[in-house]
């Protein structure tokens, strides 16, 4: 798979492959994988990809199921890249406060917060 | 501050306090703090709170600015609790795939993805 494929297209294709291979993936009835209790997905990327690793090691490879796991590893690579950009730029307090305000604003409007 | 205050109310109050104390917080003109390059904030919570720690250590405490940092530490506590819930429950592949599908769907529609 060329890594030049835009991440957004990669995600769309992966969603389709996930539906296609569902039956094969659920074949192992004893396997248990951590599933987050909440929907703040970005907080749980590490656990999600650990789960994908567990699933991959238990799934018979070949054909397009291999492409599914390859796609997922490219998505992980993208997210890891995003995480590296979290602390890459040292800015003035003003810019940090703007970002903090934005972060809290997003938390206020978009996060799934339990009472 | 009672930790019983709902997190959503805590976030709102913190946003207000941030505006109130902006002038005091930006007083240190030499201080530089890592600021994420992208807007996928949840990926960067660790770095954001490290930055808050740096800012707190450089800010003269007292009055409601102390409340601001107390609030921010309660928000961190909430996020840490959410992170603990990422891997707490081991479920069957079926549930994991439903969650993975949701995660990829959210990535597809809500994440800020650079080309």
């Amino acid at each position: 798979i060329p890594t030049e494929i835009p991440t957004s297209a990669l995600v769309k294709e992966t969603l389709a492959l996930l539906s296609t291979h569902r039956t094969l993936l659920i074949a192992n009835e004893t396997l248990r994988i951590p599933v987050p209790v909440h929907k703040n997905h970005q907080l749980c990327t590490e656990e999600i990809f650990q789960g994908i690793g567990t699933l991959e090691s238990q799934t018979v490879q070949g054909g397009t199921v291999e492409r599914l796991f390859k796609n997922l590893s490219l998505i992980k690579k993208y997210i890891d890249g995003q995480k590296k950009k979290c602390g890459a730029e040292r800015r003035r307090v003003n810019q940090f406060l703007d970002y903090l305000q934005e972060f809290l604003g997003v938390m206020n409007t978009e996060w799934i917060i339990e009472s | 501050i009672p930790t019983e205050i709902p997190t959503s109310a805590l976030v709102k109050e913190t946003l207000a306090l941030l505006s109130t104390h902006r002038t005091l917080l930006i007083a240190n003109e030499t201080l530089r703090i890592p600021v994420p390059v992208h807007k996928n904030h949840q990926l960067c919570t660790e770095e954001i709170f490290q930055g808050i720690g740096t800012l707190e250590s450089q800010t003269v405490q007292g009055g409601t600015v102390e409340r601001l940092f107390k609030n921010l530490s309660l928000i961190k506590k909430y996020i840490d609790g959410q992170k603990k819930k990422c891997g707490a429950e081991r479920r069957r592949v079926n549930q994991f795939l439903d969650y993975l599908q949701e995660f990829l769907g959210v990535m597809n529609t809500e994440w800020i993805i650079e080309s």
Epitope: T30, K39, I112 | R91, R92, Q95, Q101, E102
Partner: antibody
């Protein structure tokens, strides 16, 4: 407070369809899955399926697949359960129930909607 | 599908009695089991989740135990308002399945 309020009782003829609504209030609708459960007169409880209002994804008990359709209207925080090709054995009270987390326990239940199928 | 077998199907007891209801799953469901109470003509109400975790507001006389395939609901001292039907529910795998219910009646 968190509430699920269901639509009123329905009487339908065999072969017809019924659509039961479940209006959520007191919480963010997209945060929790909505499950549907039914109970025939004097019988036990039976899971029909769940819908995730976050992404409109639904999953069904095979027994109801093809006949039950779960949908949501995010603008009104309402979940719907439509059952087609009704037969007399579909006479039951239909409940919606909120999932506390992801595939978790049912923490809030609707009051139930009686659907009677009779010619 | 996972079968849930509840026993007894009904029991008669007096106020103050200790009551035990059991539920057996046809396969390992970890601890993903809840206990539900239903009074005649009313909506069900969840009492316990994750096999042994009491839901807020539920009296402490209710307790749950077990993991894997065998589970128990205990009411330590039966109260008049506890006369109802009790169901177990496995939410470990799809489709979720209920036990057939245990009716607790006044002796």
């Amino acid at each position: 407070q968190v509430q699920l309020v269901q639509s009123g009782a329905e009487v339908k003829k065999p072969g017809a369809s019924v659509k039961v609504s479940c209006k959520a209030s007191g919480y963010t609708f997209t945060n929790h899955h909505i499950n549907w459960v039914r109970q025939a007169p004097g019988q036990g409880l039976e899971w029909i399926g769940y819908i995730n209002p976050y992404n409109d994804y639904s999953r069904y008990n095979q027994k109801f697949k093809g006949r039950a359709t779960l949908t949501v209207d995010k603008s009104t925080s309402t979940a719907y359960m439509e059952l087609s090709s009704l037969r007399s054995e579909d006479t039951a009270v239909y409940y919606c129930a909120r999932d506390y987390g992801n595939f978790w326990y049912f923490d809030v239940w609707g009051q139930g909607t009686l659907v009677t199928v009779s010619s | 599908d996972i079968q849930m077998t509840q026993s007894p199907s009904s029991l008669s007891a007096s106020v103050g009695d200790r009551v035990t209801i059991t539920c057996k799953a046809s396969q390992d469901i970890n601890s993903y089991l809840s206990w539900i109470q239903q009074k005649p003509g009313k909506a069900p109400k969840t009492l316990i989740h994750r096999a042994d975790r009491l839901i807020d507001g539920v009296p402490s006389r209710f307790s749950g135990s077990g993991s894997g395939q065998d589970f128990t609901l205990t009411i330590s001292s039966l109260q008049p308002e506890d006369f109802a039907t009790y169901y177990c529910l496995q939410y470990d795998d799809f489709p979720y399945t209920f036990g057939q219910g245990t009716k607790v009646e006044i002796k």
